[in-house]
Each structure stands twice: as C-alpha cells, then as structure tokens.
C-alpha cells in the first residue's frame, strides 16, 4: 500500500493532525524534499552572519559572513576574522609574518618564500611579508619556443570549494 505522505511535494508536510493531507510549511520553515512529515526551521543569519539567500518553502536560508570575516565549515557554519595581508591568524589573534614568509590573503597562515635557486633561477624581486619572491626565468623558459611568463592570476575569493 502506498504511503499517502509520499505524494506531498517539497514545500509541504504530511499533516497527521489533518488526515495526512499535505499542508504548506508554516512561515520560517521549509521542506526540501517530498514526503516529509515535518518542515525544518529556517536558518537565521544573525550577528557576524549575513543572509546570502533567503529561506523559501523549499530551501533553507544560506549565510555568509559580514565584511572583515570569512566562512569556515560546510554551509558557512562559522565566521572567522580576517587579518591583513602580511599577517596570519593565530589562536592569539593576527600576527605579522616572520621574515622569509608572506601571506597575500586575508586568511590562512604565512607561507615560506619561494627558493628560486632550487629550480636554477635567480631572484628578480625580493619578497615581502605580503608578496612572494619573484624568480627570473628558468633555463627551460629561455630555450627557443618556450612559453612566456604567465600574467598575474585573476583575483579570486579563496575558500573551500564547495563551501
């Protein structure tokens, strides 16, 4: 025998109090799949969280972080403070990168400068706490037919994909 609740589409729930008819989800709740016996409460984006996508009867709200913070965890479960470029976020707060390391992002930790000599290249431009060393072309790049130096990468929003 088919469960009558299986006919209830997303955005509704199977109401046991009303002879298992399909009732619309109440305000501030949703059901993303059919055949649900309850609707889930919508996520509320409060404090450092801001609403990226409003809740609807068929899908939960999605949050991201207010400026100065970035998302961590599946579905942006947490907002963590940004640091400045040239810094890293430690458990004790933002801290300047040590000499020989850099961070060109507002999150993450400081990365060691590239050691150009490992690939037989010379240093074209010394590194800073915000920028890596720039190496000269490798011997392979100087050979006939080799491709030229790559232009800078487009700006991107770093983070785990998908969030």
């Amino acid at each position: 025998l088919q469960d009558p609740c299986s006919n209830c589409p997303a955005g509704t729930f199977c109401d046991n109090n009303r002879n298992q008819i399909c009732s619309p989800c109440p305000p501030n709740s949703f059901s993303s799949a059919g055949g649900q016996r309850t609707c889930d409460i919508c996520r509320q984006c409060k404090g450092v969280f801001r609403t990226r996508k409003e809740c609807s009867s068929t899908s939960n709200a999605e949050c991201d972080c207010t400026p100065g913070f970035h998302c961590l965890g599946a579905g942006c479960s947490m907002c963590e403070q940004d640091c400045k470029q040239g810094q890293e976020l430690t458990k004790k707060g933002c801290k300047d990168c040590c000499f020989g390391t850099f961070n060109d992002q507002k999150r993450g930790i400081c990365r060691p400068w590239t050691n150009c000599s490992l690939d037989g290249r010379s240093v074209l431009k010394t590194g800073t706490t915000e920028k890596d060393v720039v190496c000269g072309p490798s011997p392979a790049d100087l050979s006939p037919g080799a491709s030229s130096v790559t232009p800078p990468a487009p700006a991107r929003e770093p983070g785990h994909s998908p969030q």
Partner: antibody, heavy 120, light 110 residues
Framework: QVQLVQSGAEVKKPGASVKVSCKAS????????MHWVRQAPGQGLEWMGW????????NYAQKFQGRVTMTRDTSISTAYMELSRLRSDDTAVYYC?????????????WGQGTLVTVSS | SYVLTQPPSVSVAPGETARITCGGD??????VHWYQKKPDQAPVLVVY???YRPSGIPERISGSNSGNTATLTLSRVEAGDEADYYC????????????FGGGTQLIILG
C-alpha cells in the same frame, strides 16, 4: 566541478626519471597552488612539495631537493612533477592535490593517483 | 622538522565512537587537517583547520585540538568508515612545510 586527472601508471628502471602530469578543470588553474603527495606500498602519506601555477614558484621538501622538479603549463591547465635518479624506494602512488585558495588549510581536491614502479 | 604521532590502529564496534589521536609539540597552536584514505582511492579531506567539515562530510565526524593532542572523533561508526586516517599540519618554519602523521587504521569489529 573541480577535477584533477593524472597520467597513467609508469614502470621505470633505477636511475631513470619519471614525469607525472595532473590536468585541472572546473576552476581557474592559476588561482590555486598545487601540491604533490606520495604513498609508498604499506607506508603513509608523504608531502613532496608545491607549485604556484601562476608564477611557477615552488617549494620542495628537503628530502627531494635536487631530484624533484615541479612545473606547469598554464595553456593546458596542467601541473607536472618530475622525479629523477629513481630508486626502488620511489615506488609509490603519486597524487596531485589542490590547496583551497589560501595556505594553512587542508588539501580539498585530489587526483586519482599515478602508480610509479621502479624495478630493474 | 615537526613530527606528528598517531596510533597504528584503533578498533571499535559498529555504532560505537572511535577517537583517533594525533600528537605533536604544542599542536594546539597549529591548524590540523584530517584525511580518510581507503585502499586504491585518493585521500579525502574530512576535517580541516581543527574542526571544520567540508561539504558532504557527515556531522558524526568531528575534530578538536588543544595542548599537545588533536583528536578526530567518529561517532556511530559504520562499516564504511573502515580506512586509514591521517592528520596533517603546515610548518612554515621548517624545510619540510607539509607534515603528515604516520596514519591510523580504523578497524570495525564484527
């Protein structure tokens, strides 16, 4: 969706070199560092190094310095790892893995692995 | 360079909770990442930066980190959780920035 597809298995003799490729798709190749990690039979994961596909800048684990070279071809969104002077204990599965856009987090996408067998 | 120490194996019955530890000097000051590795498959990131799960990783997998020990916890363990688990940190101050623990085999009893 993000995908890293590696070249096929290789069998090499001691002293030879091997070059493994890792073709990226589903994201901007030059925007994310690529790492190489290997696993020898019955052993754990071992980090080998990274390359910045935008600048070509590299960092290698000291153990591999002088034997490993990481390069990239941005025109075909492909990273390469070449290991020279191969020994029998270089027999391993070699993985490329993507960093998620900033340093200090976990490696979020991995290639399927390339088995390199070094045998005389 | 920095050393991470894991137990070689952890055994647990289905439905129980497994805890896998990763020891290192002042590891609580570092960000620890955990990977699941099954035979003939690529590693999968299951926890990053101590306690955050990537999309698609079930909520019964969690992480914590303080003092000299980081812990990966798998609650209500299932047969499909049987795998090797590796902790990992980045150590910018050394000549070997990427550091993995030796791995722990999670054995599901019965």
């Amino acid at each position: 969706q993000v995908q890293l597809v590696q070249s096929g298995a290789e069998v090499k003799k001691p002293g030879a070199s091997v070059k493994v490729s890792c073709k990226a798709s589903g994201y901007t190749f030059t925007g994310y560092y690529m790492h190489w990690v290997r696993q020898a039979p019955g052993q754990g994961l071992e980090w080998m190094g990274w390359i910045n596909p935008n600048s070509g800048g590299t960092n290698y684990a000291q153990k591999f310095q002088g034997r490993v070279t990481m390069t990239r071809d941005t025109s075909i969104s492909t990273a390469y790892m070449e290991l020279s002077r191969l020994r029998s204990d270089d027999t391993a599965v070699y993985y490329c893995a993507r960093e998620p856009g900033y340093y200090g987090s976990g490696l979020d996408y991995w290639g399927q692995g390339t088995l390199v067998t070094v045998s005389s | 360079s920095y050393v991470l120490t894991q137990p070689p194996s952890v055994s647990v019955a289905p439905g129980e909770t497994a805890r896998i530890t990763c020891g290192g000097d002042d590891i609580g000051d570092k960000r620890v990442h955990w990977y699941q590795k099954k035979p003939d498959q690529a590693p999968v990131l299951v926890v990053y930066e101590d306690r955050y799960r990537p999309s698609g990783i079930p909520e019964r997998i969690s992480g914590s980190n303080s003092g000299n020990t980081a812990t990966l916890t798998l609650s209500r363990v299932e047969a499909g959780d049987e795998a090797d688990y590796y902790c990992q940190v980045w150590d910018s101050s050394s000549d070997h920035p990427g550091v993995f623990g030796g791995g722990t085999q999670l054995i599901i009893l019965g």
